[in-house]
Every structure is written in structure tokens, then in C-alpha cells.
Interface confidence: medium
């Protein structure tokens, strides 16, 4: 009884009804396996989800999320607002970067901008919300004798600029 | 025969969890889809979601997907549902049913009655 | 979400009448020539039994009296002839899209 079920592809279930014969999958529905006694329902790409690849009868349909909206977790299983650079998502919504922090991406959290003074390095271009500070050669080099490109920014720990 | 065996009554306080389970016997667990079933005293009957115990695939109805976390352990034919953030709302009996090819419950569970009460 | 209206809410039927309940969708149930339209019979303290899917196939081991039929929106579950073991509850139920949904239920008696 087994072995007859294990003969029936992906895309097919084995229908106990009709003595064991294969089946095609129901309509919106799907099995990647062999030998399955049900199909899978086909995921639906609604609300702030749109579809990325039909579902077939042997592979499910695959979502993105629509225009202002990123992916999350395996498969794109949640979608998140997007926010601007220079903001992060809150409960609240969307909030820009505290000071002393950036984040140049339309998703994810405010990161600290970089403390140039840890590498021994000085701040060449001061950060922002949307941008980490740049830094640097370290002051030694660019004692004399030594060769820049570039002359030194004013050293402003931690990379302050207006907001 | 092919039969599906459910845990014991709960009983939990408001907030806690509780994580019930459905033991198949009978028949291959892997082939079959276990879907869950919620029906609150002299009331109708809602659809929670459904695992396939092959791939581990899960759908849920939107109005659960915070509420029930459904999981299957292959190596002892048991599927099981979790329920968080408990509720006067959620003291109903739980049923796992298996579903049929033509997308049908052919076998049911006794069900699982869960109590939420301070 | 596609719902099922079910009608009458509660039924009294005589010994070896016909008994009929119907089963309203908001929507086609219907794809691609599959009524994804079942029905289930319940007795107090009892889960759900299958009595018909796809809208007229009899489950295993289901009486002969018990017949189903229609397709789109408008199904029907008929019980002929009416047997005293028959009072319980019916539910129609939909498998055409998630989230899967019941009929609010007929309370079928003996009159």
C-alpha cells in the first residue's frame, strides 16, 4: 500500500479514495515531495504582500512586500514600513537618529557613528544622521615628512555636525 | 484504526500559555496534513491553522498568528499547538483534525477542553 | 474571508421525512470544477464527523440517507429518510481559501 503511494510524483497526492492512485494537487495548492497523502494550500501574497513567483503544483508562491515596505524573517514571512535614511522604526512609527547616531538604510536601527579616536584615527568628514564619520590618517601621520592627500578636518570628537 | 489522541483538559490563568498535543496513530503522520480546530461552548467552529509534519510548512488563519504556534515532532507522531497571552476568549475545545486529499477532516481528535480562569 | 450562512438555524423533522439544510457562501466555493464545499455532523461532547466533501461525495461509512448537492454559493445537505439517531448539530464548511471557514451551524431535532 505504501509503495504505491511512494510512486506518485511532486505535484500529485496519493488519493485514498481511488485506490491509491495519484491525484493532481486541488486548485492553489502544491506538494514539492513525493508520496504525500494531501497537497499543501498555496501561500496567498495579500495586504502588504505581493507575489514574487506563482504558486505552481510543485512549489509554493513566493511574496514580496509592496512599495514602501521591506522583508523580514525566512521567506519574507513579515513586512516592515520602510523608514528614510537617517530614521529607524519605532512603536511610534518612524523617528529620525538620535544625535551621535546614523543609519543609511531605509530599515534596521540607528547605529553609533564610528569613534575615530578609538583607532587612534582623527574625524575627516563629520557624521550625520544619514552618514557615519568618516576618518582620517591618525595625527602621527601627518607630521612632517609624512605624505597626505588629504589635509586634516577639525578634530571634533565624536563627529558632531548640526543637525 | 487511524486515530488521533489529544492531551488532557488545562486549566491556566490569564496571560500564561499552554501547549497541547496530538498523537496519530494508524497511519503514516508525515503524509497527512494536521490541521487545528477552535469551537467556545454552543458555539460554531473556527479554523487556527494546519502543519505539515514533512516539510514543517504552517499556515494560520490571520486571526490566530499570535496567538498559536503549531509544531510536529516526526519521531513520535505527534503534532502540537501552543497558545500564548491566554484569555477569557480562548476557554474553548481544541481539535486536531487530519485532512483528507480532497481537502477535508476525515479523522478528528476527542479535542482538548482549556479553561482560562483567575 | 469567505462566509457560510447557514439556513435554518434549528430544524424539527419528523421519523423518516426529509430533513434539509442549506448553506449559503459569500463567494464561489467552485475552482476549476471542484466544489470545495464539505459538511460534518456533531453530537454533544463529540468532535465533528464527516458526512459529504466536494459538495456530494459521501465519506467512508456514511448512510446512503445522507446526500449532498450545489455548487458556487448555494449547497444543501438533505436527510432522507429522517432517523432518530440523526439529532445533532451540522456544520457546512469551506476549503476553497485560507482562512478556512464553517456555517454558523443548523441544530437539527425530531419533531
Known amino acids: 500500500l505504501q509503495d504505491l503511494c511512494s510512486n506518485c510524483p511532486a505535484g500529485t497526492f496519493c488519493d485514498n479514495n481511488r485506490s491509491q492512485i495519484c491525484s493532481p494537487c486541488p486548485p492553489n495548492s502544491f506538494s514539492s515531495a513525493g508520496g504525500q497523502r494531501t497537497c499543501d494550500i498555496c501561500r496567498q501574497c495579500k495586504g502588504v504582500f505581493k507575489t514574487r513567483k506563482e504558486c505552481s503544483s510543485t512549489s509554493n508562491a513566493e511574496c514580496d512586500c509592496i512599495s514602501g515596505y521591506h522583508c523580514l524573517g525566512a521567506e519574507c514571512s513579515m513586512c516592515e514600513q520602510d523608514c528614510k535614511q537617517g530614521q529607524e522604526l519605532t512603536k511610534k512609527g518612524c523617528k529620525d537618529c538620535c544625535f551621535g547616531t546614523f543609519n543609511d538604510q531605509k530599515r534596521g536601527i540607528c547605529r553609533p557613528w564610528t569613534n575615530c579616536s578609538l583607532d587612534g584615527k582623527s574625524v575627516l568628514v563629520n557624521g550625520t544622521k544619514e552618514r557615519d564619520v568618516v576618518c582620517g590618517p591618525s595625527p602621527a601621520d601627518l607630521s612632517p615628512g609624512a605624505s597626505s592627500a588629504t589635509p586634516p578636518a577639525p578634530a571634533r570628537e565624536p563627529g558632531h555636525s548640526p543637525q | 484504526q487511524v486515530q488521533l489522541q489529544q492531551s488532557g483538559a488545562e486549566l491556566a490563568r490569564p496571560g500564561a500559555s499552554v501547549k497541547m498535543s496530538c498523537k496519530a496513530s494508524g497511519y503514516i503522520f508525515t503524509t497527512y496534513a494536521m490541521h487545528w480546530v477552535k469551537q467556545r461552548p454552543g458555539q460554531g467552529l473556527e479554523w487556527i491553522g494546519y502543519?505539515?509534519?514533512?516539510?514543517?510548512?504552517?499556515i494560520y488563519n490571520q486571526k490566530f498568528k499570535d496567538k498559536a504556534t503549531l509544531t510536529a515532532d516526526k519521531s513520535s507522531s505527534t503534532a502540537y499547538m501552543q497558545l500564548s497571552s491566554l484569555t477569557s476568549e480562548d476557554s474553548a475545545v481544541y481539535y486536531c483534525a487530519r485532512l483528507g486529499g480532497h481537502w477535508y477532516f476525515d479523522v478528528w481528535g476527542a479535542g482538548t477542553t482549556v479553561t482560562v480562569s483567575s | 474571508d469567505i462566509v457560510l450562512t447557514q439556513s435554518p438555524a434549528s430544524l424539527a423533522v419528523s421519523l423518516g421525512q426529509r430533513a434539509t439544510i442549506s448553506c449559503r457562501a459569500s463567494e464561489s466555493v467552485d475552482n476549476y470544477g471542484i466544489s470545495f464545499m464539505n459538511w460534518f455532523q456533531q453530537k454533544p461532547g463529540q468532535p465533528p464527523k464527516l458526512l459529504i466533501y466536494?459538495?456530494?461525495n459521501q465519506g467512508s461509512g456514511v448512510p446512503a440517507r445522507f446526500s449532498g448537492s450545489g455548487s458556487g454559493t448555494d449547497f444543501s445537505l438533505n436527510i432522507h429518510p429522517m432517523e432518530e439517531d440523526d439529532t445533532a448539530m451540522y456544520f457546512c464548511q469551506q476549503s476553497k481559501e485560507v482562512p478556512w471557514t464553517f456555517g454558523g451551524g443548523t441544530k437539527l431535532e425530531i419533531k
Open positions: 502543519i505539515n509534519p514533512t516539510t514543517v510548512y504552517t
Open positions: 466536494s459538495a456530494s
